[in-house]
């Protein structure tokens, strides 16, 4: 008799999910000579343990801590590229840009970059059928509350001035319910931060308008500044003009506006 | 671990020199090498990791060529000048430094 | 690029005495902590005496020991026995994809009297 199984509302674990977290874990060390001191078996280990046999609708950040110990990484705290809604060119970006850091460019993001994963309560299997969705199911999932402590300790770790690239052909460039706007922005340290600068990045070849004057980029200048962090804005009118003078400044074309 | 290779060369004439690693699987390790000019300091060239992605010095970026096989990791010097005169290392990478076995160094003299 | 600028470049002591040798880097090592110390003697090898700014090699007495955080590092030997005398050398590490991964210190050359 085939045992009941909980359906959720989201697509379940990503197919050979243990395996890609293992490779992941083994290529990023390699890539980052630096980080070879991690043993890839107990970083998956820590990662399993974080849900598996767990009810996936009450995932703690308390469950993900011993995973957040093996994967602790210095990146340097100036260097750092929040994004929000426009994931792909901030990692365009930091692969022409070495030296700067979006969350998927460390060890715990590029592990998990674009993965589902869940298990059942009391039993140690992995859920390929379904997930919980954060909106139709419950926002203490296992996908949700990694991407949640993740983000807040990065956040934390920031220094100087920190970049966010935001998508300005959204209708909503600042999101207070995304990630960046709900964590992030919120875990910035005061004491540590000078300012936040935000790149809006322009959808449309014609789109001369300047979206610094958004009410939503308004609206994150405000939160920005009654915690005592300066805010600046810049538009990223042609983000293809703004990739190619990352990769050569030289270029005579990049002195005027991109 | 142990280099070999090392001799006379005049300028310009590529050289290769070989890490035989025992007692342990290149497979596992990451291998550095560093070379050492008569009376001079220790110099990091690059190294190569268990999957052979390697990382060079800035300075040393087009003038060396590091590879491995199972057995063996080797490094090319691809246009010696006298400047590449030197005790050449090979070192095993542990964890966290540059090197916890070295082998005896061979000897690279780049004269006309 | 990064440089690891040691001082002294030659320190004298007598057996006994106390030596210490400091190194400083032009930006923070990875981890702050990745740095390393090696002793090399003429003719010999470097050999791995002390890794992670503090922690001591396989083998190694216990009259070497090494502090310090981000740019500024000590190794100091306690005690210092004849068998001491040969050059020291730091070596920092860095994250590679956007500097050298390793980088040596000029060098101290340690004379016992």
């Known amino acids: 008799v085939p045992r009941w199984r909980q359906q959720w509302s989201g697509p379940g674990t990503t197919k050979r999910f243990p395996e890609t977290v293992l490779a992941r874990c083994v290529k990023y060390t390699e890539i980052h000579p630096e980080m070879r001191h991690v043993d890839c078996q107990s970083v998956w280990d820590a990662f399993k343990g974080a849900f598996i046999s767990k009810h996936p609708c009450n995932i703690t950040e308390e469950d993900y801590q011993p995973l957040m110990k093996l994967g602790t990484q210095t990146v340097p705290c100036n260097k750092i590229l929040l994004w929000s809604r426009i994931k792909d060119l901030a990692h365009q970006f930091t692969q022409v840009q070495r030296d700067m850091f979006t969350l998927e460019d460390t060890l715990l993001g590029y592990l998990a970059d674009d993965l589902t994963w869940c298990g059942e309560f009391n039993t140690s299997k992995i859920n390929y059928q379904s997930c919980p969705d954060w909106r139709k199911d419950c926002s203490n999932n296992p996908v949700s509350v990694f991407w949640k402590t993740v983000s807040r300790r990065f956040a934390e770790a920031a220094c100087d001035v920190v970049h966010v690239m935001l998508n300005g052909s959204r209708s909503k460039i600042f999101d207070k319910n995304s990630t960046f706007g709900s964590v992030e922005v919120h875990n910035l340290q005061p004491e540590k931060v000078q300012t936040l600068e935000a790149w809006v990045i322009h959808g449309g070849r014609e789109d001369s308008r300047d979206l610094c004057q958004d009410p939503t980029i308004k609206e994150l200048e405000s939160i920005i500044s009654k915690r005592n962090i300066q805010f600046s804005c810049k538009n990223i009118y042609r983000p293809d003009k703004f990739l190619q003078c990352v990769k050569n400044p030289e270029d005579s074309s990049c002195t005027s506006e991109i | 671990v142990e280099e070999s290779g090392g001799r006379l060369v005049t300028p310009g004439t590529p050289l290769t020199l070989t890490c035989t690693a025992s007692?342990?699987?290149?497979?596992?390790?990451?291998m550095s090498w560093v070379r050492q000019a008569p009376g001079k300091g220790l110099e990091w060239i690059g190294f190569?990791?268990?999957?052979?992605i390697t990382y060079y010095a800035s300075w040393a970026r087009g003038r060396f060529t590091i590879s491995k096989t199972s057995t063996a990791v080797d490094l090319k010097i691809t246009s010696p000048t006298t400047e590449d005169t030197a005790t050449y290392f090979c070192?095993?990478?542990?964890?966290?430094?540059?090197?916890?076995?070295w082998g005896p160094g061979t000897l690279v003299t780049v004269s006309s | 690029a990064q440089v690891l600028t040691q001082t002294p470049s030659s320190v004298s002591a007598a057996v006994g005495g106390t030596v210490t040798i400091n190194c400083q880097a032009s930006?923070?090592?990875?981890?702050?902590?990745?740095l390393s110390w090696f002793q090399q003697k003429s003719g010999q090898p470097p050999k791995l005496l002390i890794y992670?700014?503090?922690s001591l090699a396989s083998g190694v007495p216990s009259r070497f020991s090494g502090s310090g955080s981000g740019t500024q590092f000590t190794l100091t030997i306690s005690g210092v026995q004849s068998d001491d005398a040969a050059s020291y050398y730091c070596q920092g590490e860095f994250i590679c994809t956007s500097a050298d991964c390793f980088v040596f210190g000029g060098g101290t050359e340690v004379v016992v009297k």
């Open positions: 070192a095993r990478v542990d964890a966290y430094s540059a090197g916890d076995l």
């Open positions: 007692g342990f699987s290149l497979s596992s390790y990451y």
């Open positions: 930006q923070s090592v990875y981890s702050d902590n990745r």
């Open positions: 190569i990791s268990k999957t052979a």
């Open positions: 992670s700014t503090s």
